[in-house]
């Protein structure tokens, strides 16, 4: 004989079961009977905390009885078999189905054994992220928007950014009762350095195997930022032609480049070719300040550069050639 107390029967079930809104879910519940132990189960009962009566009963002689026959079904219990599996399937999950349920075995002679199971009703959210196109406002504004629609429980949204900024997150009821739509904005002071950079929206939800990452490429509209390159302070007479380049960063793209000098129109040796200015060889020293004026949809900005062409032995220097 085994020593007494070694062979008690135990009801096994998970403490929590997730199910999706509108789907079906099985609440697993089993009676574990040690090898030597004799037991006879006459009834299986499911009830919900806070509600009187049973929602599902399986009786050894009468079979199943349900409070909502179209929504409930014993998965394995059958007349004429040992009742060891009380697992119950619920169809068409509703928000109000969420709660604590008790699975009970009426066993002889050990007595009734039960376990509580928490049914969580989940809704998998749909996630989107989009850029909020902005101009240089000088104050914090939303530059990206991340929306997790129709989640239960509400999704958790965080942002990852090297650009600084802060989130502003809000919740609103979802389309389906009991669901929640979470909207999170990433807010910062727009600058040209931010344009084209990315931030990542991270959405976490217990229905996801892993967090969803949504990358947003930021758009900041700003007028041109202009500089002129190509001059190294070492230009000399009688050398090859040289080129100045008008470097402009802007969003949207520049629509036009206009070259001039502080004295007015370009001299004959300077020929404008869009963003570039071709400086032809000259035979006498010059000291001219060139102006590049760049236009885009938001305005025009300019840069100036003073160029000196000096006398000197061309063999010792690179001369005017900047190529």
């Amino acid at each position: 004989w085994p020593p007494p107390g070694t062979g008690d029967i135990v009801v096994q079930a998970p403490t929590q079961v997730p199910g999706f809104l509108g789907d079906s879910v099985t609440l697993p519940c089993y009676l574990q009977v040690p090898g030597m132990e004799e037991t006879h189960v006459s009834q299986l009962t499911w009830s919900r905390h806070g509600e009187s009566g049973s929602m599902a009963v399986f009786h050894q002689t009468q079979g199943p009885n349900y409070s909502e026959p179209k929504r409930l079904e014993f998965v394995a219990a059958r007349l004429g078999t040992e009742l060891r599996d009380a697992s119950l399937r619920m169809f068409g999950l509703r928000v109000e189905d969420e709660g604590n349920y008790t699975c009970l075995f009426v066993a002889f002679p050990q007595g009734s054994r039960s376990v509580d199971i928490w049914l969580r009703v989940l809704a998998k959210p749909q996630n989107t992220a989009e850029v909020q196109k902005v101009q240089l406002t000088g104050k914090p504004v939303p530059v990206a928007r991340c929306v997790s629609t129709g989640g239960r429980p509400p999704a958790h949204i965080t942002w990852h950014s090297d650009l600084g900024g802060m989130p502003n997150t809000s919740q609103a009821p979802g389309f389906l009762s009991g669901t929640v739509t979470v909207t999170s904005l990433w807010i910062l002071v727009p600058s040209s350095q931010v344009d084209g950079k990315s931030v990542t929206c991270k959405v976490e939800h217990e229905s996801f195997e892993k967090p969803q990452l949504l990358t947003v490429n930021l758009t900041v509209y700003y007028p041109p930022e202009v500089s002129i390159s190509g001059y190294d302070n070492n230009w000399y007479l009688s050398q090859n032609e040289a080129t100045l380049t008008c470097d402009a960063r802007s969003n949207p793209e520049p629509t036009g480049y206009n070259w001039s000098t502080t004295m007015g129109p370009l001299p004959p040796f300077a020929v404008a070719q869009g963003a570039q200015l071709l400086i032809r060889p000259v035979d006498k020293p010059i000291n001219t300040t060139f102006i590049c004026n760049v236009t885009n949809a938001l305005g025009a900005r300019q840069a100036e550069l003073t160029v000196q062409v000096k006398e000197g032995p061309p063999s010792e220097h690179s001369g005017m050639s900047s190529n």
Epitope: W1, P3, P4, G5, S42, Q60, P109
Partner: antibody, heavy 121, light 109 residues
Amino acid sequence: QVQLVQSGAEVKKPGASVKVSCKASGYTFTSSYISWVRQAPGQGLEWIAWIYAGTGDTNYNQKFTGRVTMTTDTSTSTAYMELRSLRSDDTAVYYCARHGLTGRHWYFAVWGQGTTVTVSS
Amino acid sequence: QAVVTQEPSLTVSPGGTVTLTCRSSTGAVTTSNIANWVQQKPGQAFRGLIGGTNNRGPGVPARFSGSLLGDKAALTLSGAQPEDEAEYYCILWYSNKFVFGGGTKLTVL
């Protein structure tokens, strides 16, 4: 109220069989567990077996396996215990007992008055 | 074969308290043994008192209580009445069979 009424005394010869009845009243017979217990003269109580009246499912004390059969007749709410190949040491008072639930636990709630079975040549 | 042992006899004064115990030959009695206690008064049928170690049957006076006391099952009678004079049997479950104790003859004197 709940009552178990057993059949009258029996005198049997060794090797014979005896069938003792236990008629239940005052409760739903088909949902009940009934145990059979005996007490030989000058001896202690000995559990024989139990039966679930609704399905006829049984569990026998291994000592009696093969020699005892328990049955029920749900139409008359009666439980039966048949003991075969009787020996002199089967002489005893045989009791039926209904198990009742107290909270979540079973107990030997109500007993029959007992049936004396005497095995003598 | 498991043997269940009880005190053969005990005496209690009216209004007094007495504890009957039930020992198992196989070791400590636990809740898995679902100890039962039944009473038999002279000339009367048996009557169930306790099931599942400590659960009183309906209609059983509150002066009867079941428990585990050390490695034994126990039935405590607090405030004994003359009508409590009877034979008390302990019953233990051993995985596939019930085993009865020899009984305790309780005298209220």
